[in-house]
């Protein structure tokens, strides 16, 4: 409905159907086209005082056709409508208005949300996220081996990112400690992370180990272990179960 | 004579998406909207939504806003429909129409889209 | 949405009588005069066809005997005399508001 105008011609003949062009059915010379070929629209055309009839395959923009058995018309859309299918179903609104079921208005209904990008009132989107994964090996500096204590984590995907008035999305990251049994790394046995890191110089006492980058989610500082009885291990086996910690990420 | 010829019959899994293409002829592309209407199997009409070749504006019904997308390509004449997130319910027979003056005049032949897993 | 409310869902007519079909909206389909109600019929494995908008104009190509009437919310398509070629499904359906709705649809069987 946004197309472009018929061409007029310079030449009609009174009343002539053969003399007529531009879509014309019927014609005169004083007024333009009186009557129109089919699929094709009647509309008047202000030149200076005088209103001359011109056909057109589509109505302009700010008018809607409507098909009578006799001829096709081109109506105005209502004041606040740029584009539309009627005067009670607007497609697109003018400035300063936002479309909704045809209708244009100054603010969106309760329970929508004005998009300035397309000017229209769409649905509060809230956020949507999968179910978790699940949660990865407990590792230790990227290690698998070597330690008692170490974090694991798991994450989620986000499905639907909410809109503007939409609910946050929850954490998509969760980390927690976690406790293996205590497993002798193998000669040359290296963390799972597959990413070359930066290495330290060990400290005294201390195994050379790849360190985790500061992105890396460890919920906090590893305690240096000590050695313990086999009493103290169970006992600290319960507890920690128990401490389980989380850490998240909030997108 | 104006034609509007669909593409041809899709199968697709629950998740995944599909786009529908309706090619015109025998007419100026841009002077009428093309319209989307759906038919499930021994169901009756549904209409999804509009597209104004002219300026590629578009408009859906709310029932598929979230996953309906509908697009024009002026140098081919031809119309597309998305849509995404497909369930079994979506298992129908896809059709284009060209909008005149408030009807729906000429009609592709349809496409017809089977959900299953 | 507007909801329109066909009847019968189904007829069965016999050669020559008349079948008479009702298409009720839940609210008008008119403005500034115009009625917004358009009939379509549709064969198995068809898509459908326009045979009246406007609530009373026959498209053209469109057999006389298919007419069309009311206004408001109350809508008729009457077929006289009934020949064997208009067994198939009819459908109103209103083009006023957004969204554009159907009926359910109406099945003609010939007796």
């Known amino acids: 409905q946004n197309a472009s105008r018929g061409r007029r011609q310079r030449r009609m003949h009174p009343n002539v159907s053969q003399g007529c062009q531009g879509g014309c059915a019927t014609c005169s010379d004083y007024n333009g086209c009186l009557s129109c070929k089919p699929r094709l629209f009647f509309a008047l055309e202000r030149i200076g005082m005088k209103q001359i009839g011109v056909c057109l395959s589509s109505c302009p923009s700010g008018y809607y056709g409507t098909r009578y058995p006799d001829i096709n018309k081109c109506t105005k859309c209502k004041a606040d409508c740029d584009t539309c299918f009627n005067k009670n179903f607007c497609t697109k609104c003018k400035s300063g208005f936002y479309l909704h079921l045809g209708k244009c208005l100054d603010n969106c209904p309760e329970g929508l949300e004005a998009n300035n990008h397309t000017m229209e009132c769409v649905s509060i989107v809230h956020c949507e996220v999968s179910e978790w994964n699940p949660w990865s090996p407990c590792t230790k500096k990227g290690k698998t081996c070597g330690f008692k204590r170490g974090t694991e984590t798991r994450v989620r995907e986000i499905i639907q990112h909410p809109s503007a008035k939409g609910n946050l999305c929850p954490p998509t990251n969760e980390t927690r400690k976690c406790t293996v049994q205590r497993k002798k790394c193998q000669k040359g046995e290296r963390g799972k992370k597959g990413r070359e890191r930066k290495r330290k110089k060990p400290n005294k006492g201390e195994s050379k180990e790849a360190i985790p980058d500061s992105k890396s989610l460890e919920s906090s500082k590893e305690i240096p272990e000590q050695r313990e009885n086999k009493q103290q291990q169970k006992k600290r086996k319960v507890q920690d179960k128990q401490k389980s910690v989380s850490v998240s990420t909030v997108h | 004579q104006v034609q509007l010829v669909q593409s041809g019959a899709e199968v697709k899994k629950p998740g995944a998406s599909v786009k529908v293409s309706c090619k015109a002829s025998?007419?100026?592309?841009?002077?009428?909207?093309i319209h989307w209407v759906r038919q499930a199997p021994g169901q009756g009409l549904e209409w999804i939504g509009y597209?104004?070749?002219?300026?590629?504006?578009?408009g859906y019904n709310q029932k598929f806003k979230n996953r309906v997308t509908m697009t024009v390509d002026t140098s081919y004449s031809t119309a597309y429909m998305e849509l995404s997130r497909l369930r079994s319910e979506d298992t129908a027979v896809y059709y284009c129409?060209?909008?005149?003056?408030?009807?729906?005049?000429?009609w592709g032949q349809g496409t017809t889209l089977t959900v299953s897993s | 949405d507007i909801v329109l409310t066909q009847s019968p869902a189904s007829l069965a007519v016999s050669l020559g009588q008349r079948a008479t079909i009702s298409c009720k909206a839940s609210?008008?389909?008119?403005?500034?005069?115009?009625?917004?109600m358009n009939w379509y019929q549709q064969k198995p494995g068809q898509p459908p066809k326009l045979l009246i908008y406007?609530?009373?104009n026959l498209e053209s190509g469109i057999p006389a005997r298919f007419s069309g009437s009311g206004s408001g919310t109350d809508f008729t398509l009457n077929i006289h005399p009934v020949e064997e070629e208009d067994a198939a499904t009819y459908y109103c359906?209103?083009?006023?508001?957004?969204?554009?709705?159907f009926g359910a649809g109406t099945k003609l069987e010939l007796k």
């Open positions: 597209i104004y070749p002219s300026n590629g504006d578009s």
């Open positions: 609210q008008s389909v008119d403005y500034d005069g115009d009625s917004y």
């Open positions: 025998g007419y100026t592309f841009t002077d009428y909207s």
């Open positions: 359906q209103q083009s006023n508001e957004d969204p554009l709705t």
């Open positions: 406007a609530a009373s």
């Open positions: 129409a060209t909008y005149f003056a408030n009807n729906f005049d000429y």
